[in-house]
């Protein structure tokens, strides 16, 4: 079998809401993946599991099941959304994200994603990690790749 390539493209959008009483930030982060099937037969993308970390704390998890089938030598772009919560244990972040004296409230999040594919009963897992900038101060849509954090901090491919 040839490889199945998973490429994390970046954050597509981040929608933010707040609970001032509990100093909580809710961020719905939509990410984009490109999955390429280099085989001469179809493969099934069985599930995608994702988690988001802020400052070594997991702030959100998501799992998508029975996603799609990718045909021979084909590529599909898949969007997945991770709902995240930065709760009052990090209430200083609420103050930062709602500070009106600054325009952009970028925070660095680590995006982790694992894609499970199956073909002929065989299962394969491919994982990616990426640091991304996300603006926690407003709803934002990004050009793909625009939210990339400094490349030097990215894990090796």
């Amino acid at each position: 079998p040839r490889s199945i390539d998973v490429k994390y493209i970046g954050v597509k959008s981040a929608y933010v809401s707040y609970d001032v009483q509990k100093r909580t930030i809710y961020l719905n982060i939509t990410n984009t993946l490109n999955i390429t099937n280099n085989n001469y037969y179809s493969v099934e993308v069985e599930n995608i599991t994702a988690q988001v970390q802020f400052s070594k704390t997991v702030i959100g998890k998501a799992r998508l099941n029975n996603i799609t089938i990718i045909g021979p030598l084909d590529m599909k772009q898949i969007d997945y959304t991770v709902p995240t919560v930065i709760a009052e244990e990090m209430s200083y972040m609420y103050d930062f994200c709602t500070l009106i004296s600054i325009k952009v409230h970028n925070i660095v999040l680590m995006m982790q994603v694992t894609v499970t594919t199956t073909y002929f009963g065989h299962s394969e897992q491919i994982s990616q990690e990426r640091y991304q900038y996300v603006d926690c101060g407003r709803n934002t849509t990004y050009q793909l790749g625009q939210s990339e954090y400094l490349n030097v901090l990215q894990p090796q491919q």
Epitope: V20, Q21, K22, T24, Y26
Partner: antibody, heavy 117, light 112 residues
Framework: QVQLQQSGPELVKPGASVKLSCKAS????????VNWVRQRPGQGLEWIGW????????IYNEKFKGRATLTVDTSSSTAYMELHSLTSEDSAVFFC??????????WGQGTSVTVSS | DVLMTQSPLSLPVSLGDQVSISCRSS???????????LEWYLQKPGQSPKLLIY???NRFSGVPDRFSGSGSGTDFTLKISRVEAEDLGVYYC?????????FGGGTKLEIK
Amino acid sequence: QVQLQQSGPELVKPGASVKLSCKASDNTFTNYDVNWVRQRPGQGLEWIGWIYPRDGTTIYNEKFKGRATLTVDTSSSTAYMELHSLTSEDSAVFFCARTLPQAMDYWGQGTSVTVSS
Amino acid sequence: DVLMTQSPLSLPVSLGDQVSISCRSSQTIVHRNGNTYLEWYLQKPGQSPKLLIYKVSNRFSGVPDRFSGSGSGTDFTLKISRVEAEDLGVYYCFQGSHLPWTFGGGTKLEIK
């Protein structure tokens, strides 16, 4: 230790308004929220409302909406609650409480309000 | 509104006793952010309430370790392992998860 000093007892006529104050011993109200709580004689505690001093955002118990007005003067670290259209049902002790996201950690000593003609 | 029901209403004790106070909410009080904002306050006669426990089981600073909180979902308990004279008063549970925030009716801890 944070101390919240509330204004003295009030005797007011039915239909009138009263404005109670709650002064912090430090500049606590620039960093913390304030809740107000009512306790009728021999009764339990009832949450009135909450204020976020940084921008004056308020949230009220529906029961008190339109009758209670919460404000904060951060320069003097004083919180205020004004209660309008008082009836005998409003005769109670009113407490202010400094509030973290997790809980009401320090309370004032309470202000007694008596509504009587 | 979330109704907070405490039991018993009155709890006669002897000094040194271990006691439990129950608090039941009419619906789950897990906040949208995942935390459970269940607090316990003690009000001594003629005084303002004092915070004992926050977020179900966290003791507030200066609160003796004979006080402990537990529970989840809709059922919560405050335990006092050895009652002392200074513990007498009315105990209130409180939920700060769903608006309007609500108190329980109170449990009066008194000497037998």
